[in-house]
Each structure stands twice: as C-alpha cells, then as structure tokens.
C-alpha cells in the first residue's frame, strides 16, 4: 500500500497506424499536489508526451476534463498514430517541490505497439534482357510494416516458386520493418506472356495479401530462327527469295540482304504477325535479277535483333541453268542452302 499509486491498467495497447491510441491512467489520490506527466520511455532520455502543468501537445487530448474538480483520471489519447510512436508510455505523478516539481510516483507503463501495413510490393527484374534457358533474378521490396512477422511468396503464372531468399530488416527491435526478397527464375521461350508475382501477407491485411508483379515480356529476349527459301520464278530472269524470321521477341529487328557479301537492302521489321505465345514472325523477300549475274549468287539474310550480334542464314542461287526452265521446286532443289551464324 502507498499513499498515492499511479495505475496504468493496460500492460499493452495495439493500434493500427493512422488511428488513435488511448493510454489509461488513474491516481489513487490527489495529494500531494502536483501535475501528471506522460513520457515515452524511461530514464534520462525519455520523451515528454504530455504535461498537465504546461506546454502545447497538439496530438494529445485528455480523456477526462482535467479541470474538473478532483479529477483522478489522467488517461490520454494520441491521434494519428504512426510506427514511430511505438514504445512504452509512463504516466508519472509529480509533487510540488522547491524550486522544481519532483517525480513522485510512476505507473508501471503501457507498451504501445503499432500495426502498420506494408507498402505495395515493388518487383524489379534484371537490367538487361536474357534469353530462354537462362536464370534471371527478380527482387521484391516492401516497407514500413509492423509488427515484424510477415510472409512473402513468389509465383510464376500462378505456380509457386521455391528458389528465393528473403530478409526482413532490421534484425532487432524497430518501429517499422522492411522486407527484401530475391527469386531466381529460369526463362523459357514461352515466357513472353508470363508474369512473376510477389505476394506479401501481414496481420494488418486481414487475409488479403498485397501483390507486386513483373511481366517477363520486359525481361526476356527470344532470338529469331531464320529460314531462307527460293520461291518460284516470278518473271523471266527473276528469282524471289524470302527470309522467314520466326519466333522473336521483342519486335526491334533489322534485316539486311547481302548478295555475294554486298549489302543489297536493309529494312526494319514493321508489319509483323504475332504468335499465340507473344513472339513475332516477319518475312522479307528479295527479287534477284539472275541475268545480272554470270556466276552463282550467295544470298545472305542477316538479322540484328534487339541490339544483339547479327545472325544470318545464306542461300546459294545457281545461275548456270536457264531460269525459265526451272520450276518452283527444281529451283529450290538445284540450289544449295548453307546456314551460318555469326556471333
């Protein structure tokens, strides 16, 4: 028993960020005369939250009217709570002293815990594109949550991934926390339409996790396959040669025709067709005037895709036979086709 006790009935209080915290405190006596003060923390570095005697505390209101006669309820409300407000709050009775007021009795303290929602997860992929069969890393970050417990999962097209590492910082006590996770994803040729999803679950989200996404279309590069074919004769002394550029992504592509190593024409892919998997096809053709050549002609379709080293495919066009005697099939059969990749 004591002549005055300061009672803080709540050992802990849990409040969502943005809400108002009520910290309860009553005194068993008004004697000795002196003010009540609220502090966050203990010891010399404690922070004054409210002083009954004097001061301006815009976020703090008293639950009771402290000017009311013989009031012994010194509970306070703190508005617009943020994670930075977390800590242990002490209701302290002072007695008048000479010259300064003297701390008389302290309550046992109320620990204020703040529940703060994590920020929307931000997923970022590699800086440079990568090709199928390569492994790329994706990172996911979310900040500002409290308490520390949090769950993070990775998905690719709805399938949960297992190859990832996650860290929550800081390791020790803090007002709020951040999560950082890195997942490894193996690319396939079909990934243009794929999505990588980072899913964060936290107590503040009430079972409705937050998701961040990254489209693999921003990460993948599918190199084209080339096919050069000789088409039936279109007119006397003319042969139509086509270069089929298939299954490439992204669309940025430049094609150059070479006749016996000399640039004949350069063009940029424009009117492309899109495949179901999101890759593109494109065709370029070259009309070769056979009569202009005495010897066989080596036609090369050279493709530079998305700033990568050029890929090419060649087709040998024999001019010894009379073009008008060649059928569409025999023309193709009578010409050899060499495939050559230049890196």
């Amino acid at each position: 028993e004591e002549e005055l006790q300061v009672i803080q009935p709540d050992k802990s209080v849990l409040v969502a960020a943005g809400e108002t915290a009520t910290l309860r405190c009553t005194a068993t006596s008004l004697i000795p005369v002196g003010p009540i003060q609220w502090f966050r923390g203990a010891g010399p570095g404690r922070e004054l939250i409210y002083n009954q005697k004097e001061g301006h505390f815009p976020r703090v209101t008293t639950v009771s009217d402290l000017t009311k006669r013989n009031n012994m309820d010194f509970s306070i409300r703190i508005g617009n709570i943020t994670p930075a407000d977390a800590g242990t709050y002490y209701c302290v009775k002072f007695r008048k002293g000479s010259p300064d007021d003297v701390e008389f009795k302290s309550g046992a303290g109320t620990e204020l815990s703040v529940r703060a929602k994590p920020s929307a997860p931000v997923v970022s992929g590699p800086a440079a594109r990568a090709t199928p069969q390569h492994t790329v890393s994706f990172t996911c970050e979310s900040h500002g949550f409290s308490p520390r417990d949090i769950t993070l999962k990775w998905f690719k097209n709805g399938n949960e991934l297992s190859d990832f590492q996650t860290n929550v910082d800081p390791v020790g006590e803090s007002v709020s926390y951040s999560i950082h996770s890195t997942a490894k994803v193996v690319l396939t040729r079909e990934d243009v339409h794929s999505q990588v999803i980072c899913e964060v679950a936290h107590v503040t989200l009430q079972g409705d996790p937050l998701r961040g996404t990254a489209n693999l279309s921003e990460t993948i590069r599918v190199p084209p396959t080339l096919e050069v074919t000789q088409q039936p004769v279109r007119a006397e002394n003319q042969v139509n040669v086509t270069c089929q550029v298939r299954k490439f992504y992204p669309q940025r592509l430049q094609l150059t025709w070479l006749e016996n190593g000399n640039v004949s024409r350069t063009e940029t892919a424009s009117t492309v067709t899109e495949n179901k998997d999101g890759t593109y096809n494109w065709m370029s053709w070259l009309l070769v005037n056979v009569s202009a050549h005495r010897d066989d002609v080596k036609l090369t379709c050279q493709v530079e895709h998305d700033g990568q080293p050029a890929v090419s495919k060649s087709h040998d066009l024999k001019v010894s036979a009379h073009p008008k005697e060649q059928g569409s099939n025999t023309a193709a059969e009578n010409t050899g086709s060499n495939e050559r990749n230049i890196y």
């Epitope: 028993e1 008004l30 004697i31 006669r69 000479s98």
Partner: antibody
Framework: QVQLQESGPGLVKPSQTLSLTCTVS????????VNWIRQPPGKGLEWIGI???????DYNAALKSRVTISKDTSKNQVFLKLSSVTAADTAVYYC????????WGQGTTVTVSS | DIVLTQSPASLAVSPGQRATITCRAS??????????MHWYQQKPGQPPKPLIY???NLESGVPARFSGSGSGTDFTLTINPVEANDAANYYC?????????FGGGTKVEIK
C-alpha cells in the same frame, strides 16, 4: 492498523539539539511520507517538514537551517533533529502520516529549559 | 508563505444549530482542478483528527453533519446540526504551497 508513536526526551537545554523518534506500524515508510508538526502550549499548529517515501525531504523555510528529518525504513522509524533550541521551541511534537496527514501520533511534549 | 485566517476565533452554538467556520487564504490554494485545503478537529490533550480533505471530501468515519465547501481562497466548514461532542478547536490547513500552513484555529463551544 495504522499507528504512529512519538518518543524522545521531554526536557532539552537551550542551544542543544532536540531529537525525537516516530515509530510507525501498519504501513511502510517506503510507500508513505511522514510529517512532523508542532504545537506550542495554547497555540496553533506549525508544520515542520516531511520525509517522503523515497527519502526526499521538504522543510518549513522558517526552520530549515535547524531541521533534519531522516528515517530508518528497516526499523520503521522516522527521526527529527532540531538544533540550537530555545524556549520558543517548547511544544507538543506530532508525527503524522503522508501528505494527507490522515493519521497522527498522540504527540510528545518537549520543554526547552535550563 | 500562505497565511490562513480563520473566523471567528471562537463561537458558541446550541445543540441542533448550525456552526459555520470560514478560512481565508492569502492566495489561492487551487491546483490542477482541486483545492488543497483540509480541516481538522482537535480536542484538549488529543492530536488533530482529520475531518475534510480537498475542501469538500469527508474523511472515512466522520459524520455527515460535517461538510466543507469553497475554492480558491475562501473556504467554509459547516457543522449541522451541532452536537455536544463537537466542542473542540477546528483548524484549516493548506498543502498547495510550501511551507504547509495551518489557520489560527476556531474554538467551538456548546451552549
């Protein structure tokens, strides 16, 4: 139940130091303060000072230079020392519990005389 | 120091009548919504007995015939109805400022 009992010499010579003891029961000296009050014969009450539960003290400025209040918590005793006494210090001396002075001892009479 | 002036210095009251004692402080004894003024009864050869604390609150075991009122500098102790057993000296006391002080006392006699 709560009790306070003053004790000490009934006669003190002028210029000497008056020493009194207040022995308490029914409450803890760490939880409650104890006051000393005196009452000269036929006169009113005068507050001398208080020792709080934490051991800190507050004194009447008129007597502060001559007064010391201390305590021995383990023995449940509070002590008053008043130095350089004169006949004007002749009084009944009371100890009373806490800032509220809700319980009083019966008092002890101290006469200052040669 | 806060000086407490009690009046009257003495009064004689018949049993069943009302006795009113006033205590005027030289400065306010109010702080933080309370008046730190208290009243004591002292009979000859006995220590003071607490009657009223914080101007108007009855101490445990004190008959409801006793009541206190007032704030700031002016306070009143009322005994209604007075009984023969109420003959005593009555003191007001403040502990709002150091040094804590008592009034000079009022002697109540029963006719």
């Amino acid at each position: 139940q709560v009790q306070l009992q003053e004790s000490g010499p009934g006669l003190v010579k002028p210029s000497q130091t008056l020493s009194l003891t207040c022995t308490v029961s029914g409450f803890s000296l760490t939880g409650y303060g104890v006051n000393w009050i005196r009452q000269p014969p036929g006169k009113g009450l005068e507050w001398i000072g208080i020792i709080w539960g934490d051991g800190s003290t507050d004194y009447n400025a008129a007597l502060k230079s001559r007064v010391t209040i201390s305590k021995d918590t383990s023995k449940n005793q509070v002590f008053l020392k008043l130095s350089s006494v004169t006949a004007a210090d002749t009084a009944v001396y009371y100890c009373a519990r806490a800032g509220k002075m809700d319980y009083w001892g019966q008092g002890t009479t101290v006469t200052v005389s040669s | 120091d806060i000086v407490l002036t009690q009046s009257p210095a003495s009064l004689a009251v018949s049993p069943g009548q009302r006795a009113t004692i006033t205590c005027r402080a030289s400065e306010s004894v109010d702080s933080y919504g309370s008046s730190f003024m208290h009243w004591y009864q002292q009979k000859p050869g006995q220590p003071p007995k607490p009657l009223i604390y914080l101007a108007s609150n009855l101490e445990s075991g004190v008959p409801a015939r006793f009541s206190g009122s007032g704030s700031g500098t002016d306070f009143t102790l009322t005994i209604n109805p007075v009984e023969a057993n109420d003959a005593a000296n009555y003191y007001c006391q403040q502990n709002n400022e150091y040094p804590w002080t008592f009034g000079g006392g009022t002697k109540v006699e029963i006719k």
